[in-house]
């Protein structure tokens, strides 16, 4: 049985059917639903047999329907159901508001029933204008949305409907006026160069699409300057103005077509930078150095002019980078003075010329030459030369003979000394001595040198010869050896030689107790360091014993007799007699005479008495051989 | 019999010092002239300096005056030498000799290493 | 010059005689003295004055001179004499001490 049908509204565009039936009896139902006054077409449905209810959407609203419904059992319909119903009222947007306005935007809040509507209709349009309005849709779940890109300080009317398929609900309107565009902050220079500038802004961020800057010389008609800038910027350096000039800088913001009111700031540029505290001084004998100071980075390059102040006509230009503070200028004449002129060039500008006079100084010299501590193989150099000047001294040796080859010696510009060593002794020499400069060469200066011989021992002389030594005497340089040794050795080789070791300071050497006539030689070498010279050499005879000789008798009395005797003359210091007699019987009788004599009278004698006699000679206190002889006093 | 020892050689920058030694034994060491001599590595022999025996007189090659000085000490039998300002040119073995008043040096040591780098 | 100058090298047959000579001024005033040294080892003194030989040197040692040359023979040359020779003199006050440059004694 079917049976119990219900019909309810289900919001404004739809109606619910409910109803009852046994269970798995109907294969479907169908249903159609008609407006009331019939004035569409039924609409109908098939529906599954195993279905209690069903909703029919897409209907119209506040509209009455008939809805009939029956059951299809193996082909059979059962008897229809009917009954009426009515859909609900349009659902209405609730209050509209503008939430939050700007100077280009406002926040737009509504209410409307949940799930009523697909989209809405926005419309913005400016009042007492005739301009298009702006149009737009948001997604029906939405209750608020922005509007921007609006003007600033400009009525505005909205509009909003919500819409559902074929259905527009009544709009609801709200007039608003937009703010007015935000004012720029303060706008200063921070910084003013004889060129440039630089200007610094405030304003809130994020508000301006760009800047506009306009750099007008105060109280000119010429063109302005104009400059767009990025709206994100706060800070603007102006380059290319000129120096010492008063200008008005003005800005304003814009965005979207809007411009603020504009700022304004009035600056005058600095003066020209100057160039300032030219020095010139000398550097060595062919140079200056010129320092001046200037502001950085200011200048594009110096022009420098170097004049002899005696010489219009030659003048020498250099131009040099900006950056530099400091030149060397080489090349120039010794001990000349100079006219240096500077100035600067800033794009194109030249600023006052500068100039300074200065000489250079006297060309470098070399004197003094001096040689000093000659050995026999060195010696030392030394000079006077200018400081600071000279890379390298040469010096050339010369024999003044010119038999040995030329020897050449370069050295340090720092050195006044040289030390010149394997040279030969005893050589006479020539030294050169010249100074190099960069650019220059002094002129030579010459001085003479003999190296010492070596040192010498010679001249060995034997004097004083004396039967029992001599002396021996040499030459020798002085300082020059250790020691002396001195060798005696008897011609025949038959006794040990003597060796006397004697100071290096000694020149002599007195030998005693050598036997007497016979042959020696003498040899004399120098010790130095242990290195003993070749020997100096002498062969000499002592002389022979001094002889007293030709004892005689004569003149015989009977109390003495006469003696008479020969003597090498010269020798001997005296002579002593011996008398005794020859039995024994009476005391000797010494006499002692003086070296002259010759003979001598002895008196006092026994008669007829026979006497032996000896006699000697004693020189430098040594005894001659004894003569002696046998005499008889006569008779009485 | 005659020995001769030197010590304190080894490596040293230029510019530095060293003090050589010699010890000396077998023989009247107060009685001696005593010397140095050296050889730089492959060379030949350079006489460096002497001393007279009671240490009043001493002598240098021109190559080394002014920088090195020697000395001795006889109650200790011992010769020195004190280098200083020492340069490359410096490296060498050094050997101690004595030589007696009328002899070149007779008795040597067998030296001490020098070496003069950085 | 005030050096004084020795051959590099010389070298002689086993048994054989060889003279080994140096030049120099001071030759003329002083004798030379001569040095034997083998490698790794300290000098030592074979000839000095005139031609004297300190003791336990071989007498197959001699010396001599003449004007500004001075000469080591070595009359017999052994195997064991292979070595550096160095002669060595006096200058004077101011170069107490010189010496050559050195021979290389090789015997072959």
């Known amino acids: 049985e079917l049976e119990n049908l219900t019909v309810t509204e289900v919001g404004w565009d739809g109606l619910r059917l409910n109803w009852t039936a046994a269970d798995q009896a109907y294969e479907h139902f169908i249903i159609q639903v008609q407006e009331a006054n019939k004035v569409e077409a039924a609409r109908n449905l098939t529906v599954p047999g195993s279905l209690r209810a069903v909703d029919i959407p897409g209907l119209k609203a506040a509209t009455p329907y008939t809805v009939s419904i029956y059951g299809v059992i193996q082909g059979y319909r059962t008897p229809v159901l009917s009954a009426e119903a009515s859909t609900g009222e349009t659902p209405n947007l609730g209050e509209v508001v503008v939430a939050e306005v700007g100077w280009d935007a406002l926040k737009l809040n509504w209410t409307a029933p949940e799930g009523a509507y697909e989209y809405f209709f926005i419309q913005v349009q400016e009042a007492d204008t005739v301009e298009a309005a702006q149009n737009l849709t948001v997604p029906g779940g939405l209750r608020s949305t922005d509007l921007p890109g609006l003007k600033a300080a400009t009525h505005y009317t909205i509009t909003i409907r919500g819409v559902t398929q074929d259905f527009s609900t009544t709009p609801l309107s709200v007039e608003v006026l937009t703010e007015e565009v935000p004012d720029m902050g303060n706008l200063t220079v921070t910084e003013v160069s004889w060129d440039a500038l630089r200007l610094n802004w405030t304003t809130p961020d994020g508000t301006y699409d760009q800047f506009t800057i306009q750099v007008q010389e105060a109280d000119q008609v010429e063109e302005a300057h104009n400059l767009t800038v990025p709206g994100s910027l706060r800070s603007m350096e102006i380059p290319g103005l000129r120096a010492g000039t008063p200008y008005t800088v003005t800005l304003h913001g814009e965005v979207r077509g809007h411009s603020t009111r504009p700022l304004a700031v009035e600056v005058v540029t600095e003066d020209l930078p100057q160039l300032g505290d030219l020095a010139v001084s000398e550097v060595g004998w062919d140079g200056l150095r010129l320092n001046w100071t200037a502001a950085d980075n200011a200048y594009e390059h110096f022009v420098i002019q170097v004049q002899e102040v005696n010489k219009v006509e030659a003048a020498q230009n250099l131009t040099l980078p900006g950056s530099l503070r400091a030149v060397d200028i080489p090349g120039l004449e010794a001990a000349t003075p100079y006219r240096v002129s500077i100035y600067g060039v800033i794009r194109g500008y030249r600023t006052p010329v500068l100039s300074a006079e200065a000489s250079t100084a006297k060309e470098p010299e070399i004197g003094n030459l001096n040689v000093s501590d000659i050995t026999p193989e060195s010696f030392n150099l030394s000079w006077m030369a200018t400081d600071g000047i000279f890379e390298t001294f040469t010096i050339e040796i010369i024999d003044s003979n010119r038999l040995l080859e030329t020897v050449e010696y370069n050295i340090s510009g720092a050195e006044r000394t040289a030390h010149i060593s394997g040279l030969p002794p005893s050589t006479d020499f020539i030294v050169y001595l010249s100074g190099l400069a960069p650019s220059i060469r002094t002129k030579t200066i010459s001085a003479t040198a003999t190296t010492e011989a070596l040192p010498l021992l010679e001249n060995l002389t034997i004097s004083d010869i004396n039967p029992y030594g001599f002396t021996v005497s040499w030459m020798a340089s002085e300082n020059a050896f250790d020691s002396f040794l001195v060798t005696v050795v008897d011609s025949g080789k038959l006794l040990d030689p003597q060796e006397f070791t004697l100071s290096g300071t000694q020149r002599k050497l007195e030998l005693r107790g050598l036997i007497t006539g016979i042959g020696y030689e003498v040899m004399v070498s120098g010790f130095t360091q242990g290195h003993q010279t070749k020997p100096l050499r002498a062969e000499i005879v002592t002389e022979a014993e001094p002889e007293v000789d030709n004892l005689l008798v004569s003149d015989a009395t009977p109390d003495g007799f006469r003696l008479s005797w020969t003597a090498d003359e010269g020798v001997f210091d005296n002579f002593v007699l011996k008398i005794r007699d020859t039995k024994k019987q009476s005391e000797p009788l010494e006499i002692t005479l003086l070296a002259p004599e010759r003979t001598r009278d002895i008196t006092g004698l026994r008669e007829a008495t026979e006497y032996e006699i000896e006699l000697y000679g004693i020189s430098k206190g040594r005894r001659s051989q004894t003569v002696s002889a046998i005499a008889t006093t006569a008779m009485g | 019999e005659v020995q001769l020892v030197e010590s304190g050689g080894g490596l040293v920058q230029p510019g530095g010092s060293l003090r050589l030694s010699c010890a000396a034994s077998g023989f009247t060491f107060s009685g001696s002239r005593m010397g140095w001599v050296r050889q730089a590595p492959g060379k030949g022999l350079e006489w460096v300096s002497a001393?007279?025996?009671?240490?009043?007189?001493?002598y240098y090659a021109d190559s080394v005056k002014g920088r090195f000085t020697i000395s001795r000490d006889n109650s200790k039998n011992t010769l020195y030498l004190q280098m200083n300002s020492l340069r490359a040119e410096d490296t060498a073995v050094y050997y101690c000799?004595?030589?007696?008043?009328?002899?070149?040096?007779?008795?040597w040591g067998q030296g001490t290493l020098v070496t003069v780098s950085r | 010059s005030s050096e004084l100058t020795q051959d590099p090298a010389v070298s002689v047959a086993l048994g054989q005689t060889v003279r080994i000579t140096c030049q120099g001024d001071?030759?003329?005033?002083?004798?030379a003295s001569w040095y034997q040294q083998k490698p790794g080892q300290a000098p030592v003194l074979v000839i000095y004055g005139k031609s004297s030989r300190p003791s336990g040197i071989p007498d197959r040692f001699s010396g001599s001179s003449s004007g500004n040359t001075a000469s080591l023979t070595i009359t017999g040359a052994q195997a064991e004499d292979e070595a550096d020779y160095y002669c060595n003199s006096s200058h004077g006050p101011r170069r107490p001490v010189v010496f050559g440059g050195g021979t290389k004694l090789t015997v072959l």
């Open positions: 001071s030759l003329r005033l002083y004798y």
């Open positions: 001393i007279n025996e009671e240490g009043g007189q001493t």
């Open positions: 000799a004595k030589h007696p008043p009328h002899r070149p040096f007779d008795y």
